[in-house]
Amino acid sequence: KNLKSPQKVEVDIIDDNFILRWNRSDESVGNVTFSFDYQKTGMDNWIKLSGCQNITSTKCNFSSLKLNVYEEIKLRIRAEKENTSSWYEVDSFTPFRKAQIGPPEVHLEAEDKAIVIHISPGTKDSVMWALDGLSFTYSLVIWKNSSGVEERIENIYSRHKIYKLSPETTYCLKVKAALLTSWKIGVYSPVHCIKTTVENELPPPENIEVSVQNQNYVLKWDYTYANMTFQVQWLHAFLKRNPGNHLYKWKQIPDCENVKTTQCVFPQNVFQKGIYLLRVQASDGNNTSFWSEEIKFDTEIQAFLLPPVFNIRSLSDSFHIYIGAPKQSGNTPVIQDYPLIYEIIFWENTSNAERKIIEKKTDVTVPNLKPLTVYCVKARAHTMDEKLNKSSVFSDAVCEKTKPGNTSK
């Protein structure tokens, strides 16, 4: 009896795993084996596909074959018993185009109200993604184990922290990778669950801000309790995309180790030009808080985000404030090539009640003032980039007296 060729050959490629599946064309014939050949583009000869010779099942793995993943290849299969079937040719394909991204590896660290997610490619040193390893982005689905209501988070990098969770609660999540440059979406990881810890009696420090004074950076934060010590760590922001890099390590700022105040001062030359992440942790000697939320810190913006310079024209019921570029040492104006908004605070000299105006314009009217009254004004600049969210320190206060009545023209 003539053997029939196998049919419906499927090629599955996940990361560096090459799997072939096919259908037997005649279930009634026993003890049949199957063999594959392959052919590279531009070659006439067929080569035996190692790992896929004399296979008794309907599946084989040819991952050991060292292929150029960007080069088209052709496969053919036949059945064998005493005689052989004719060859069945599979449509040619390019491995890279056909490949799917496998499930990533996920490691979770629990805090009381946050989870830190570390993600790495499922296949270490993958040949398939060798040129794209740093281009992976990830997305995840997270849910409370008790409710099952899913939240999706897109476009995250290899390390991501989810905040505002509940203590002592089990959360589950799954992660998949994407290579947006190649329009590839990967396979989800297995579900990972972790329980957040009991609430830490020491909350993390909050409202971390960096400002510049003289040749130093001043880092300030808020804390609930007194008599604490704090440590500050930094990381190059670009490393968040690549924790596999051996440089991915949070480092101490030497002048901010075990400080007993809610601020620390360190020289500007500690950091070269660049974008950094900063975080702060509190300790009372026995217990330690979890790390604060990380803030982004851009030396370029920080160094030049100086308090605005302004002039006041006084009227009887208002001030006109004209904001100019801040001056550097040597009295040269600083050119700021990013959009700013200005926060202007003013108050009656005899009172502590402050009022605030926020404006994008550089000429601002402060209305509803009383005649012949001394008002004080200070201002600061903010970047309009939400991610960087930087502010200058406030300018020195300038105090002026309003004019007598009926001089509002």
Partner: antibody, heavy 123, light 107 residues
Framework: QVQLVQSGAEVKKPGASVKVSCKAS????????MNWVRQAPGQGLEWMGK????????HFNQKFRDRVTMTRDTSTSTVYMELSSLRSEDTAVYYC????????????????WGQGTLVTVSS | DIQMTQSPSSLSASVGDRVTITCKSS??????LAWYQQKPGNAPKLLIS???TLESGVPSRFSGSGSGKDYTLTISSLQPEDFATYYC?????????FGQGTKLEIK
């Protein structure tokens, strides 16, 4: 697979120093902390300290701070622990053990251990 | 330093028994707790990390629970190869500290 192979047993006199080595294989050496733990005969486990093989940053148990040195050689994926001014109570099996990834936010458990090196201090 | 107190210090049990070992820390350790098994002449072997996560290759009869300062290792049905000494360890604050150990013996 991950393997940590330690140097052989040592016999030392009180006041001397001992240097134990731990050769790592099967993983990226510079990506994980390496810890040292000791166990006196019939006793429990005692953490001595840890080293980051990528930059040699160390953290020590205060008890050993003045006597212990931890170093590494990235070319051979080996870490070393040297204990000086030995006394009889330092007789113990000394283990190296891999800790968490250096990129983790917090410390992790010790997932792989060397076979141990018996150090005997005797006059 | 954080003190870890394990109980009992020794325990006799039979194959098939359910066994529970407890570990208390002097401070809250936020689930940064590991359980190790050690057999005579061998290095410790990690069984459970993060208080509850079973390491790959560890039989499912081992389980960990607890939070705050109180943690438990349970072996649901003792097997002959489970007779050994078990240690808990906190890795929340340096220096990392271990419990004094629980020796599990055949009854």
């Amino acid at each position: 697979q991950v393997q940590l192979v330690q140097s052989g047993a040592e016999v030392k006199k009180p006041g001397a120093s001992v240097k134990v080595s731990c050769k790592a294989s099967g993983y990226t050496f510079t990506s994980y902390w390496m810890n040292w733990v000791r166990q006196a005969p019939g006793q429990g486990l005692e953490w001595m300290g840890k080293i980051d093989p990528s930059d040699s940053e160390t953290h020590f148990n205060q008890k050993f701070r003045d006597r212990v040195t931890m170093t590494r050689d990235t070319s051979t994926s080996t870490v070393y622990m040297e204990l000086s001014s030995l006394r009889s109570e330092d007789t113990a099996v000394y283990y190296c053990a891999r800790g968490g990834r250096i990129s983790f936010d917090y410390d992790a458990a010790l997932d792989y251990w060397g076979q141990g090196t018996l150090v005997t201090v005797s006059s | 330093d954080i003190q870890m107190t394990q109980s009992p210090s020794s325990l006799s049990a039979s194959v098939g028994d359910r066994v529970t070992i407890t570990c208390k820390s002097s401070e809250v350790i936020y689930n940064r707790l590991a359980w190790y098994q050690q057999k005579p002449g061998n290095a410790p072997k990690l069984l459970i990390s993060g208080a509850t996560t079973l390491e790959s290759g560890v039989p499912s009869r081992f389980s960990g629970s607890g939070s705050g300062k109180d943690y438990t290792l349970t072996i649901s049905s003792l097997q002959p190869e489970d007779f050994a000494t078990y240690y808990c360890q906190q890795y929340w604050n340096k220096p990392f500290t271990f419990g004094q150990g629980t020796k599990l013996e055949i009854k």
